[in-house]
């Protein structure tokens, strides 16, 4: 997945450290894992585990690696070409509407509804009406039955900022 870059992502490094590898830009751009020098003549490698760039770019800095929050697990570490992949801990999920935090999955469905989908790192349990089979869109059920969900096995990683 491709990230959109925001102000906070830029790593505060303007000068290349002596050990950083350099190469020449291609058509004014540097390859993934590099950023362009201020004079535009060199491509400077990102620092492994500290910053990264995922696409061809003319970025003056590589982007700072994300650190997973508490309540998240690190699925894969930051490399020079890919940001850290963080995923919500078991029993919690991250919605697209609120990507900043992991929220607790509900433990059961409201009365008159049945569970058809487990808690995953990117979705709450899914409930449908017993009769009609229509989905329940409410945030928190008013009354819960004793139907509980065990966290589902992730089918694919959910990248917050990769």
């Amino acid at each position: 997945e491709s990230a959109l870059i925001t102000q906070q992502d830029l790593a505060p490094q303007q000068r290349a450290a002596p050990q950083q590898k350099r190469s020449s830009p291609s058509e004014g751009l540097c390859p993934p894992g590099h950023h362009i020098s201020e004079d535009g003549r060199d491509c400077i490698s990102c620092k492994y585990g500290q910053d990264y760039s995922t696409h061809w770019n003319d970025l003056l800095f590589c982007l700072r690696c994300t650190r997973c929050d508490s309540g998240e697990v690190e699925l894969s570490p930051c490399t020079t070409t890919r940001n850290t992949v963080c995923q919500c801990e078991e029993g919690t999920f991250r919605e697209e509407d609120s990507p900043e935090m992991c929220r607790k999955c509900r433990t059961g469905c409201p009365r008159g509804m049945v569970k058809v989908g487990d808690c995953t790192p990117w979705s709450d349990i899914e409930c449908v009406h017993k009769e009609s089979g229509t989905k329940h869109s409410g945030e928190v059920p008013a009354v819960e039955e004793t139907v509980t969900s065990s966290p589902g096995t992730p089918a694919s990683p959910c990248s917050l900022s990769g």
């Epitope: 997945e1 906070q8 770019n57």
Partner: nanobody, 125 residues
Framework: EVQLLESGGGEVQPGGSLRLSCAAS????????MGWFRQAPGKEREFVSA????????YYAESVKGRFTISRDDAKSTLYLQMSSLRAEDTAVYYC??????????????????WGQGTLVTVKP
């Protein structure tokens, strides 16, 4: 809430050029990352290019490197995509996207961004 309106799409011959514009309204976009994605018929939406805040640099997909140039005019709250040396495989609906907050690294097509309605670019002889 941000509204995004793309324009500039159309039909062009291979090798031709087009300039897409994306006008943002609802808030100032100067501190926000913006970008372009595209979706060809029957294919997944794919990243094209992104512009970092404050002219700190840009990102390009390898498929458009050297042919497309992204730029922005924060005073006009407008993002541009200059497309040249267009190929048949560039035919797609092009979508403008803006990050929801300046603090959070917002993800791509499946993430929490604001999306425009899209503008169709057709490249054919």
């Amino acid at each position: 809430e941000v509204q995004l309106l793309e324009s500039g799409g159309g039909e062009v011959q291979p090798g031709g050029s087009l300039r897409l514009s994306c006008a943002a309204s609802g808030r100032s976009i100067s501190n926000y990352a913006m970008g372009w994605f595209r979706q060809a018929p029957g294919k997944e939406r794919e990243f094209v290019s992104a512009s970092v805040w404050n002219n700190a640099g840009n990102y390009y997909a390898e498929s458009v490197k050297g042919r497309f140039t992204i730029s922005r005019d924060d005073a006009k709250s407008t993002l541009y995509l200059q497309m040249s040396s267009l190929r048949a495989e560039d035919t797609a609906v092009y979508y403008c996207v803006v990050a929801r907050t300046p603090e959070t690294p917002i993800t791509s097509a499946r993430g929490a961004n604001y999306w425009g309605q899209g503008t169709l670019v057709t490249v054919k002889p």
